[in-house]
């Protein structure tokens, strides 16, 4: 049976916590990703940004989980208008920002 949206979001949050907690060396070798607008369509936008990071096992599970939240197919090189124009940040900072935002969505009951 499908996982309830609240459970799926909780699991995504916990996965992001694990990533930030287990950071020994720079996450994904310090790779940079496009910063995104966190106000709407956050799951697809986050996936569109992170999918361009390859060969980083630490975020592969996060990429798969975000894919489950995004209703359309996302491929590398694809960007929506939710990208913050010409602003790149390290994956580690991206994950931290995304984590805080998702915790707020969970509090507000926005599970989808």
């Amino acid at each position: 049976s499908p996982v309830p949206p609240s459970t799926a979001l909780k699991e995504l949050i916990e996965e992001l916590v694990n990533i930030t907690q287990n950071q020994k060396a720079p996450l994904c070798n310090g790779s940079m990703v496009w910063s995104i607008n966190l106000t709407a369509g956050v799951y697809c936008a986050a996936l569109e940004s992170l999918i361009n990071v390859s060969g980083c096992s630490a975020i592969e599970k996060t990429q798969r989980m975000l894919n489950g939240f995004c209703p359309h197919k996302v491929s590398a090189g694809q960007f929506s208008s939710l990208r913050v124009r010409d602003t790149k940040i390290e994956v580690a900072q991206f994950v931290k920002d995304l984590l805080v935002h998702l915790k707020k969505l969970f509090r507000e009951g926005q599970f989808n």
Epitope: E14, Q21, V100, K103, G109
Partner: antibody
Framework: QMQLVESGGGVVQPGRSLTLSCAAS????????MHWVRQAPGKGLEWVGV????????HYADSVKGRFTITRDNSKNTLNLQMNSLRVEDTAVYYC???????????????WGQGTMVTVSS | SYILTQPPSVSVAPGETATITCGGN??????VHWYQQKPGQAPVLVIY???DRPSRIPERFSGSNIGNTATLTIEDVEAGDEADYYC???????????FGGGTKLTVL
């Protein structure tokens, strides 16, 4: 200005009852979840319970569940804490505090009252 | 129920940086709030949602929350910062608000 004012504290014998009130002013009371927090002399803060903005839900700390009841009257901007079967360990300063109401009430308390002292003693 | 662990006391000299920790199982998955309480006064919110600061709180106060530890940092500590500090989270599983035991900050 925004304000919460508690009243109703005093000395009461074990096993008796007491009702505390919290009067809100300067903000839209009905849009906030309201909490009670207590602090025993020389001790830390202990959450007592919460009532949702519309009064539809209440949650209580295990230590007071079944003995304390939180109610609110949004037409009068008042919050109440009915305390029954009081115990010596209920002795504390009782604060009311507001928190913006979210689906799961995990919000910070951005406004507190000055507190009212409750002493349970024989 | 969810337990938050704080050191009972932290001491720091004026002008130095104070670090107060709040430990909890996967606390990084929760939004953490911090309060300052001076003797005989009601608590005051100093940090909310892990790292946000109310407008009236000086920039010297900051917060972080990673893994199993949330941290309140006070830079350039002043005598007026001497107080008890409490962390707080909402325990979703129990529908309870939880406070840490509090940390007494002493400015030497």
């Amino acid at each position: 200005q925004m304000q919460l004012v508690e009243s109703g504290g005093g000395v009461v014998q074990p096993g008796r009852s007491l009702t505390l009130s919290c009067a809100a002013s300067g903000f839209e009371f009905r849009t906030y979840g309201m909490h009670w927090v207590r602090q025993a002399p020389g001790k830390g803060l202990e959450w007592v319970g919460v009532i949702w903005d519309d009064g539809s839900n209440t949650h209580y700390a295990d230590s007071v569940k079944g003995r304390f009841t939180i109610t609110r009257d949004n037409s009068k901007n008042t919050l109440n804490l009915q305390m029954n079967s009081l115990r010596v360990e209920d002795t504390a300063v009782y604060y009311c505090a507001r928190a913006p109401q979210w689906y799961l009430t995990a919000e910070a308390f951005d406004l507190w009252g000055q507190g009212t002292m409750v002493t349970v003693s024989s | 129920s969810y337990i938050l662990t704080q050191p009972p006391s932290v001491s720091v000299a004026p002008g130095e940086t104070a670090t107060i920790t709040c430990g909890g199982n996967l606390i990084g998955a929760k939004l953490v709030h911090w309060y300052q309480q001076k003797p005989g006064q009601a608590p005051v919110l100093v940090i909310y949602d892990d790292s946000d600061r109310p407008s009236r709180i000086p920039e010297r106060f900051s917060g972080s929350n990673i893994g199993n530890t949330a941290t309140l940092t006070i830079e350039d500590v002043e005598a007026g910062d001497e107080a008890d500090y409490y962390c707080q989270v909402w325990d979703y599983s129990a529908n309870h608000m939880v406070f840490g035991g509090g940390t007494k900050l002493t400015v030497l």
